[in-house]
């Protein structure tokens, strides 16, 4: 901590664990640097925390232009892909499915949380490039809280979807009452309320501080600062990583065990093929979550325990880990929406608005064929549906 930090109840540059979206939120994981190299170290030599601060305290040693461009390119790609993918998912769901099924309600909530999380990246990028927070105190509070809020909401929704699928397979009768649109909405509201447990305190703790010519958007902690700072890190680690990994792994594991245990009297080859596809999907979903979130959580823990010299490699790897966390928000639309058969059907309608008309004409033609040539009805229609049908069981669970 910088010993000149003030009257003792404020920690300007400490970095409680980053937002659950692994984001470099202005007040979160990030420790932004000047690009021009003419900066002093406003945080002082003794600062602690994740990136050096839960503020966007400029780092000692400015990054080279190559480093800056690399980091900005990384953030820009993640931001554009994340916003485009998630807004597209939300639009298609609202426009074409009207939020009528539990699955679509979960996917919409996931896309909303992920879109909001990635929307903080432009602010963090500007902060990184300028080495100061130019957006004012209100936006500082909003951006940091959105970052934490939506990291948690996104992760809680992923957990909810794994529980939902587990219930569908292992408790099919309960699923009839549980998997309703009304219940899905209630569960989503509960997820947002749970996320408030960290989102609201962070909003109150976030503030801007003037430090030697630059402005930091930072979290302030009551004394003893080390206690509150580490408590936040531990909470984020447990509730945004350990617990979700356990829930997702256990739910999908039990689901696959249940499906494996089923004995078929006929169609066992199809069962095996379906099971392989579902297992593959589950492995991808779990692996993507772990790959995206492990690096930043490990990094945060290491930085909390030991002092890491600030080199170019350290800066780039830090920002890469942050970007990986946001990458999870980019991949969620692909894993949960674009691979879902129902969503794909709506998406095709969005891309080719005339498809429903063609389908209606086809079905009219098929009905005509059936009356004239009953034996060919299946063949004719199966050709029309072939592509759609082959995808069905391949979809990762909705």
């Amino acid at each position: 901590m910088d010993s000149s930090a003030g009257p003792g109840n404020i920690s300007d540059c400490s970095d409680p664990l980053a937002p659950a979206s692994c984001s470099p939120a202005p007040g979160s994981w990030l420790n932004l640097s000047h690009v021009d190299g003419n900066q002093s170290d406003p945080c002082g030599p003794n600062r602690t925390g994740l990136g050096g601060s839960h503020s966007l305290c400029p780092q000692t040693g400015s990054p080279s232009m190559v480093t800056a461009i690399t980091i900005m390119a990384l953030y820009s790609i993640v931001c554009v892909v994340g916003l485009f993918g998630n807004f597209l998912v939300m639009y298609v769901i609202v426009r074409y499915t009207k939020m009528k099924t539990a699955t679509n309600i979960y996917i919409f909530n996931l896309a909303l949380a992920d879109a909001l999380a990635t929307s903080t990246l432009p602010f963090q990028s500007v902060n990184y490039l300028m080495g100061t927070w130019p957006f004012g105190n209100i936006l500082c509070k909003i951006v940091i809280s959105i970052d934490y809020y939506n990291m948690f909401t996104s992760i809680f929704t992923l957990c909810t979807m794994s529980v939902d699928r587990y219930i569908a397979v292992c408790h099919p009768v309960k699923a009839l009452d549980f998997r309703t649109p009304r219940n899905a909405k209630i569960v989503n509201v509960c997820n947002w309320i749970l996320s408030s447990a960290i989102g609201l305190p962070v909003m109150f703790m976030a503030t801007t501080k003037y430090r030697q010519g630059s402005i930091d958007c930072t979290l302030t902690f009551s004394h003893p600062t080390w206690y509150w700072e580490n408590l936040l890190k531990i909470c984020v680690f447990i509730f945004a990583f350990i617990m979700p990994v356990l829930i997702i792994t256990v739910c999908y594991g039990l689901m696959i065990l249940r499906l494996k245990s089923v004995r078929m009297l006929s169609g066992s080859k199809e069962k095996d093929r379906n099971l392989r596809r579902i297992t593959r999907m589950v492995l991808v979903v779990v692996a993507v979550f772990i790959v995206c979130w492990t690096p930043i959580h490990i990094y945060v823990i290491i930085k909390a325990l030991i002092t890491i010299p600030e080199t170019t490699f350290q800066t780039v790897s830090w920002h890469f880990c942050i970007a990986l966390g946001y990458t999870n928000s980019c991949l969620n639309p692909v894993l949960y929406a674009f691979l879902d058969e129902n969503f794909k059907r709506c998406f095709r309608e969005f891309c080719i608005p005339t498809s429903s008309t063609i389908e209606q004409q086809n079905s009219a033609r098929i009905r005509q064929n059936t009356r004239e040539h009953p034996s060919t009805a299946n063949t004719v229609d199966r050709t029309n549906h072939q592509l759609e049908n082959l995808e069905a069981e391949t979809a990762p669970l909705p």
Epitope: R263, N274, N384
Partner: nanobody, 122 residues
Framework: QVQLVESGGGLVRPGGSLRLSCVDS??????MGWFRRAPGKEREFVAS????????TYADSVADRFTTSRDVANNTLYLQMNSLKHEDTAVYYC?????????????????WGQGTQVTVSS
Amino acid sequence: QVQLVESGGGLVRPGGSLRLSCVDSERTSYPMGWFRRAPGKEREFVASITWSGIDPTYADSVADRFTTSRDVANNTLYLQMNSLKHEDTAVYYCAARAPVGQSSSPYDYDYWGQGTQVTVSS
């Protein structure tokens, strides 16, 4: 030969609920679906579900009121119908199809149950 046997139909008041069941004697891994035929109308898609029971699809008219699930261990397909309306009156059929995914077209389904009557009337 796959045999599908539906049960659970009956007379119910508007706004009431009913749960239909369909037992698959062959324990197939085929995708399955529910269809209905109202008097004087074409057979209409209601819902379909993959073998795993994870991925249900619904007709727009019932999506916010009906829920389908599949018990793979007991080879039973369910349809929970809530907030029933007069226009839900129909014979409800359970169907299974060769394993190439879900479909909302009745022509894609190879095996059919005998149907169970659902009447919504005050």
